[in-house]
């Protein structure tokens, strides 16, 4: 008789999840010499230990503590790029501007990027059928708690000028309910962070509006200012040209506004 299994509303664990995490860890530590000391088997053991045999709606930040500790790394605190709803461009940017880092350029972010995972209470099985959806099922699920935990630590580590890339095509350019709006903004440390600089990325070819005047950006400015951090904002009217100019800053067309 097949055992009854909880049906969740979200997709199940990414196939070959253990192998993927382990392979990503090995690849990352090979590419980044400063992380060569990391034992990827231990990293996987800590990752697994955070959610295996636990109810997938009852995960806490503490469950991820061993993983956070084993995966801690040195990132230049003044070279941090946060993003909200515009991950691909942010990653394209840091692939070119190699001295800047998104969360997914760190070991822990790289391991989990685009993956889903969950277990089941009291069994050592990984649930490949379904996992809790943040809205429909519960917020304290393994994936959401992981990203909340690593995002908080990443923001806490930031210093000097912190950059954030925001999607100007969204109805809410700054969304208080995003990971950036609900976690990272509130964990920037005013004693270390001088300025948050927002880059608002325009979607339309002919869009010449000043999206820095958008009400949600003003809301972000208000939140940041109340935390004693300065705020600045730039429109990126042509993201394609922006990337091109990051690659080739000497190009004559790169002196004009992008």
């Amino acid at each position: 008789v097949p055992r009854w299994r909880q049906q969740w509303s979200g997709p199940g664990t990414t196939k070959r999840f253990p192998e993927t995490v382990l392979a990503r860890c090995v690849k990352y530590t090979e590419i980044h010499p400063e992380m060569r000391h990391v034992d990827c088997q231990s990293v996987w053991d800590a990752f697994k230990g955070a959610f295996i045999s636990k109810h997938p709606c009852n995960i806490t930040e503490e469950d991820y503590q061993p993983l956070m500790k084993l995966g801690t790394q040195t990132v230049p605190c003044n070279k941090i790029l946060l993003w909200s709803r515009i991950k691909d461009l942010a990653h394209q940017f840091t692939q070119v501007q190699r001295d800047m880092f998104t969360l997914e350029d760190t070991l822990l972010g790289y391991l989990a990027d685009d993956l889903t995972w969950c277990g089941e209470f009291n069994t050592s099985k990984i649930n490949y059928q379904s996992c809790p959806d943040w809205r429909k099922d519960c917020s304290n699920n393994p994936v959401s708690v992981f990203w909340k935990t690593v995002s908080r630590r990443f923001a806490e580590a930031a210093c000097d000028v912190v950059h954030v890339m925001l999607n100007g095509s969204r109805s809410k350019i700054f969304d208080k309910n995003s990971t950036f709006g609900s976690v990272e903004v509130h964990n920037l440390q005013p004693e270390k962070v001088q300025t948050l600089e927002a880059w608002v990325i325009h979607g339309g070819r002919e869009d010449s509006r000043d999206l820095c005047q958008d009400p949600t950006i003003k809301e972000l400015e208000s939140i940041i200012s109340k935390r004693n951090i300065q705020f600045s904002c730039k429109n990126i009217y042509r993201p394609d040209k922006f990337l091109q100019c990051v690659k080739n800053p000497e190009d004559s067309s790169c002196t004009s506004e992008i």
Partner: antibody
């Protein structure tokens, strides 16, 4: 080889502060956690807190929160543990150790701190 | 805080004996357990990390086992230099906590 060398013994008055140093060598200082543990005379081991020198991450035992500050100087590969508002119960040997797989693989020789009026 | 309970608190044994020390955690700590040896007036030394991994330079007569809440340190054939106090330590959650120690004495 990995070595952690701590500062010398200290005698302190109640209410004062002590700062113990721990100089690391033989490995990349910024890549490993440094743990601080103390041991009162004839007693067991008690974890106080730790630091990841490369990112300045710190975690403290709630029991010592507000009284202990752990810092690190990357330029000299030295970690520091400062304990304030000292009382007689703080008389102990204070150890630093390097973190490895959530255990502590190499230890300093220990620093005896005596709190006495 | 996670409580770590070692037993026995002390034991007397002879050279060549097989010695077993147990350590229990008040909640699941997965494999995040270390074992240390400490001699009077000296700093502790790591013997075993991650419940069963032998630290560099530690003789193979020392072994560790267990996961979850129950762990064991075994010395297969006690040597004169093994008379010391042994501590277990959990690294699953803050604050890290140690067992109260097991003193191994000469019979």
């Amino acid at each position: 080889q990995v070595q952690l060398v701590q500062s010398g013994a200290e005698v302190k008055k109640p209410g004062s502060s002590v700062k113990v140093s721990c100089k690391a060598s033989g490995y990349t200082f910024t890549n490993h956690w440094i743990e601080w543990v103390r041991q009162a005379p004839g007693q067991g081991l008690e974890w106080m807190g730790d630091i990841f020198p490369g990112g300045g991450y710190t975690d403290y035992n709630e029991k010592f929160k507000g009284r202990v500050t752990i810092t690190a100087d990357e330029s000299t590969s030295t970690a520091y543990m400062e304990l304030s508002s000292l009382r007689s119960e703080d008389t102990a040997v204070y150890y630093c150790a390097r973190g490895r797989d959530l255990a502590m693989d190499y230890w300093g020789q220990g620093t005896l701190v005596t709190v006495s009026s | 805080d996670i409580q770590m309970t070692q037993s026995p608190s002390s034991l007397s044994a002879s050279v060549g004996d097989r010695v077993t020390i147990t350590c229990g955690a008040s909640q699941n700590i997965n494999v995040w357990l270390g074992w240390y040896q400490q001699k009077p007036g000296k700093a502790p030394k790591l013997l075993i990390y991650k419940a069963s991994n032998l630290h560099t330079g530690v003789p193979s007569r020392f072994s560790g086992s267990g996961s979850g809440t129950d762990f064991t340190l075994t010395i297969s054939s006690l040597q004169p230099e093994d008379f010391a106090t042994y501590y277990c330590q959990q690294g699953q959650s803050y604050p890290y906590t140690f067992g109260q120690g097991t003193k191994v004495e000469i019979k």
